[in-house]
């Protein structure tokens, strides 16, 4: 039986402007020329999506235009990047990936990395 | 060899509930993904609701609130309670499992949802 399998890092930290990026490189089993991959995050045992892209291999990664997410890629690595993160959105935030054509359909899943987010200090007020 | 079998599926009414298991023999501790993907009539397949290897329990956005995924590990079985089944819904709903993905797959149910 084929495996896929989906690397992704434990742990990144989030920029002070709220911008996390890490990469999900997938090993994939056959070859596919069109590839989803989707973001999603772990908050008490429930899974639910952030953002997701459909891409034909070779071609950019496109995300919804309200999306929260970027990414570009490059074979088998995506690189992601998530925004306007604060620090209530701290978590696990898994990569899944989907190979989505020719068939035989393949899905993955990235044991997750944990984002930690640290809002800011507000700047002091300053007499000068 | 991991071998996966469903059951439950069938015709049911708009409105109706049904529930599907998946037994699972053959099961090996590295096997930390099981879920629920289907394939609608001309349609692709779709990740449906599903056991991750982080411990968190996944469903896609259409069958939140009606659907409910379940595992008894005593049995070997995974469970998919449907609620609530629209026309939308008919579709072969195949059990699928994995160290970290859709590595074994069973041979599928057909789930009919028709007045």
């Known amino acids: 039986c084929k495996a896929m399998h989906v690397a992704q890092p434990a742990v990144v930290l989030a920029s002070s402007r709220g911008i996390a990026s890490f990469v999900c490189e997938y090993a994939s089993p056959g070859k596919a020329t069109e590839v989803r991959v989707t973001v999603l995050r772990q908050a008490d045992s429930q899974v639910t999506e952030v953002c997701a892209a459909t891409y034909m291999m070779g071609n950019e990664l496109t995300f919804l235009d309200d999306s929260i997410c970027t990414g570009t890629s490059s074979g088998n690595q995506v690189n992601l990047t998530i925004q306007g993160l604060r620090a209530m959105d701290t978590g696990l935030y898994i990569c899944k990936v989907e190979l989505m054509y020719p068939p035989p359909y393949y899905l993955g899943i990235g044991n997750g990395t944990q984002i930690y987010v640290i809002d800011p200090e507000p700047c002091p007020d300053s007499d000068f | 060899e991991v071998q996966l079998v469903e059951s439950g599926g069938g015709l049911v009414q708009p409105g109706g509930s049904l529930r599907l298991s998946c037994a699972a023999s053959?099961?090996?501790?590295?096997?930390?993904?099981m879920g629920w993907v289907r394939q609608a009539p001309g349609k692709g397949l779709e990740e449906v609701s599903s056991?991750?290897?982080?411990?968190?329990?996944f469903y896609t956005d259409s069958v939140k609130g009606r659907f409910t995924i379940s595992r008894d590990n005593s049995k070997n079985t995974l469970y998919l309670q449907m609620n609530s089944l629209r026309a939308e819904d008919t579709a072969v709903y195949y059990c699928a499992a994995g160290k970290y993905g859709t590595d074994y797959w069973g041979q599928g149910t057909l789930v009919t949802v028709s007045s």
């Open positions: 056991i991750y290897p982080t411990g968190g329990t």
């Open positions: 053959g099961f090996s501790p590295s096997v930390n993904y």
